[in-house]
Interface confidence: low
């Protein structure tokens, strides 16, 4: 066989060229739809393995959606019919606890996880004889070897990372099954940025196939934790990026989750959204929030897909999604996964295995009810062609979905067999649905969560509460001591109380200056590459949070390091959660905190509050009887009517829903 082109194997230190044979009766040239089940014989390292594959019917829901944009920037929605897709999962005959994620679209491409090794397989470029290359995943990053770096040097470099006699995968899986008996389903939404789309030759089909392949790989990694990955949607920024991707990873992550909350959630329900970018951030290939998978505002991550294979990229996405699922880094903890490095190791690349720590972290998330959105099954367990009525998800064309016939016996509003409302019912679910009827307009459905939030009410003609809005960023709160920011009054005392308990309060300014001028993990103004940044005096109040009067020590799933610094007659308390540089640090002062007269913290700098773009003159716009909300509309006090609070009424805004009911004004809270 001809040697593959340099491009295909330049990232490999060792590989074999093989010709798999198909064991089923159908010829390889069989037309689509692809077989539901197929078996192959493949060779690896002198051994023949029989692999059994089954189409991954859980990978894509029937209503899988792809969003793109035309040249004018108009959103285009496509529901591609890809139920008979070519993405499979399976196992190696006779190999206990093996797993496989392969696509059989144009030859075999994917991952084989055996008990002691993982292999990659892909079609040999320009081969007309169904030849493939197969390689150990461990051999992917040994390119330095051909550049004059000896094996001994590599061994010395990596020896200290290797664990002595890790437990076998069988033991680990047995332990995990006991820990996580109930299957969880992550409804994943992927967004691909313009540069990555361009890099793929602006070929939407190629991007879509690659992202489905990625989801199949993720599913094969997460299945060991009894977590299934379901790709519910894909958005490709074909016409330009819809967020600013200039700046650090933290800035881009913040921009992405804000965009997600504002534009994506309303379009397609999902549990976590992951942005795929071509642009790199130096040493950081991804960033995500920890334990936020079911959060409206923070269930997202960003992932750099540059000059690497999709197989390697899968471990990056698995890592960042793992953070969303409550998993912290394995570093410095007693973790094992039966491999040299595990997916949640901070520096691991190409790892396929989750550690015992990751399983425990995820279990903590579920015990703390942080994973409730993962319980619904996105689609039925039957084949793709099966109707989706009965999956407890209201799909296109359904009015309700109460689940199995047994569950539907308990539902007074929904006809289980048809997923339609019963004849007398107006609704079957939702915050504004009670006893199969819409709640009256003016019924409170989402209360005020802070002095910077506003309530929402049912509108009387929908089962859903009005979309969540809050007071416009930059509005003064805490008696002018702070500003509203994303629905919260951001001030130091409150942040100290979240971390150190109800008696804690902000330390004096001297504490912030003294500690944050050091530029170490306990006192800094952010992290740049491999070093902490020292805070200039003017930015010290925007670095690590410093508290006093501490009487409680925090534990948030991971035990943080706590430092106590004596300063001018008080003790300054700070905390380092050691989450790593791809995770926003909850021990830093929150964005939007007032750090001086007319100033707020942003990106660890004390900057002019004008960056919040607060432009509401409440006297003029709301006639002194209301405040502006996050949509820049007046939210009026009780006694005044929207939109401008100049006539008598019952308060609220054009966004909040009616705050009263003409039949019963006592409904107002």
């Amino acid at each position: 066989a001809a040697r593959p082109g340099f491009q295909q194997t330049s990232h490999l230190s060792s590989y074999e060229i093989i010709t798999p044979w198909r064991l089923t009766r159908e010829r390889r040239e069989a037309p689509r739809p692809y077989s539901k089940q197929v078996s192959y014989v493949i060779q690896a390292e002198g051994k023949e393995h029989i692999i059994h594959l089954e189409r991954n019917k859980d990978l894509l829901p029937e209503d899988f959606v792809v969003y793109t944009y035309n040249k004018e920037g108009t959103l285009i929605t496509d529901h591609p019919n890809i139920q008979n897709h070519c993405h499979y999962r399976g196992y190696v005959e006779g190999v206990h606890n093996s797993s496989i994620a392969l696509s059989d679209c144009f030859g075999l491409r994917g991952l084989l996880h055996l008990e002691n090794a993982s292999y990659g397989i892909e079609p040999l470029q320009n081969s007309s004889h169904f030849e493939h290359i197969i390689y150990r995943m461990d051999d992917v990053y040994k390119e330095p070897l051909k550049c004059g770096v000896s094996n001994k040097d590599i061994e010395k470099e990596t020896a200290k990372d290797e664990e002595e006699e890790p437990p076998s995968m069988t033991q680990l899986l047995r332990r995990r099954r006991a820990v996580l008996p109930q299957t969880r389903y992550v409804e994943l939404f992927i967004v691909v940025d313009k540069e990555r789309y361009d890099m793929m030759g602006r070929n939407q089909t190629a991007v879509r196939e690659e992202m489905i392949l990625l989801a199949n790989y993720l599913d094969s990694m997460y299945i060991m934790l009894n977590i299934r990955i379901v790709l519910v949607g894909l958005e490709i920024w074909t016409n330009g990026n819809l967020i600013n991707i200039v700046g650090g990873a933290g800035d881009v992550l913040g921009n992405f989750v804000q965009w997600r909350e504002k534009f994506l959630i309303t379009r397609r329900r999902h549990d976590s959204a992951q942005l795929v970018l071509k642009k790199g951030f130096g040493g950081t290939a991804g960033m995500a929030f920890v334990g936020t998978v079911c959060s409206r505002s923070h269930a997202g991550g960003i992932n750099v897909f540059g000059q690497i294979t999709v197989e390697t990229f899968a471990s990056i996405v698995a890592h960042e999604l793992g953070h969303n699922l409550g998993m912290n880094h394995d570093d410095g903890r007693d973790c094992s996964c039966g491999a040299k490095s595990c997916i949640m190791n901070s520096g691991a690349s190409g790892s396929r295995n989750f550690s015992s720590c990751s399983a425990e972290d995820f279990e903590k998330l579920t015990l703390n009810k942080g994973g409730n959105c993962l319980l619904n099954i996105p689609k039925p367990d039957e084949a793709y062609s099966a109707p989706s009525c009965g999956n407890k998800l209201v799909d296109a064309g359904e009015e309700c979905d109460c689940g199995t016939p047994k569950e539907c016996e308990l539902d007074p509003c929904c006809e289980g067999s048809t997923c339609k409302l019963k004849s007398f019912a107006e609704c079957a679910y939702g915050d504004c649905c009670k006893d199969c009827r819409f709640l009256p307009g003016g019924t409170l459905c989402r209360g005020k969560t802070s002095e910077c939030d506003v309530p929402e009410y049912c509108n009387g003609s929908s089962q859903f509460c009005q979309p969540d809005v809050f007071i416009q960023n930059g509005y003064p709160c805490q008696n002018n001591k702070a500003y509203c920011y994303n629905g919260m009054c951001q001030y130091y005392d409150a942040q100290c109380q979240v971390i150190f308990g109800s008696k804690a309060k902000a330390a004096p300014k001297d504490c912030f200056i003294e500690v944050n001028s050091k530029g170490d993990r306990f006192g800094n103004c952010g992290f740049s590459g491999n070093e902490y940044k020292k805070c200039a005096t003017g930015n010290a109040l925007c670095g690590k949070l410093q508290c006093e009067n501490v009487q409680e020590i925090p534990v948030f799933g991971i035990v943080p390091a706590i430092i106590q610094t004596p300063s001018r007659g008080t003790k300054c308390w700070g905390v380092d959660f050691q989450l790593g540089s791809d995770v926003p640090d909850p021990g830093m002062v929150n964005e939007g905190t007032k750090c001086g007269a007319g100033k707020i913290c942003r990106n660890f700098q004390c900057v002019d509050a004008s960056v919040l773009n607060y432009d509401c003159d409440v006297q003029k716009k709301c006639h002194g009887h209301g405040v502006c909300n996050s949509n820049k509309n007046c939210h009026c006090e009780n006694g005044w009517a929207p939109p401008n609070c100049e006539t008598k009424g019952y308060g609220g805004s054009v966004d909040s829903g009616p705050t009263y009911n003409e039949m019963n004004t006592a409904l107002r809270d």
Epitope: V149, G283, S349
Partner: nanobody, 127 residues
Framework: EVQLVESGGGLVQAGGSLRLSCAAS????????MGWFRQAPGKEREFVTV????????YYEDSVKGRFTISRDNAKNTVYLQMNNLKPEDTAVYVC????????????????????WGQGTQVTVSS
């Protein structure tokens, strides 16, 4: 494939200065970081410094902080290592390395994370 060529090495007295260059060619758009390592006779290879291609972020090993400065010229695809106040213990072969894989949290000091290497240039500091 990225190619790296070092130059500028030589013999210098203690307290003197040298400027090393590392010219990159090939698909340099894929480079994330470029670093310098050194290897003295009979010793293990040792990390010296790194610079991030995109934004110029730098990181130095403690033993060279304040004496060595790494910089880059994007237009010329070249990285420089300015070495001042050289000491006899700085004697070694200095090798340039490039990282093209955007690892999540790269350990700059680990040679394993660099995928292209130059041939090296000898620096000898006499006392």
């Amino acid at each position: 494939e990225v190619q790296l060529v070092e130059s500028g090495g030589g013999l210098v007295q203690a307290g003197g200065s040298l400027r090393l260059s590392c010219a990159a060619s090939g698909p340099t758009f894929s480079i994330y970081d470029m670093g310098w390592f050194r290897q003295a006779p009979g010793k293990e290879r040792e990390f010296v410094t790194v610079i991030r291609w995109s934004d110029g972020f730098t990181y130095y090993e403690d033993s060279v902080k304040g004496r060595f400065t790494i910089s880059r010229d994007n237009a010329k695809n070249t990285v420089y290592l300015q070495m001042n106040n050289l000491k006899p213990e700085d004697t070694a072969v200095y090798v340039c390395a490039a990282n093209t894989a955007p690892l999540r949290i790269i350990n700059f000091r680990n040679a394993y994370n660099y995928d292209y290497w130059g041939q090296g240039t000898q620096v000898t500091v006499s006392s």
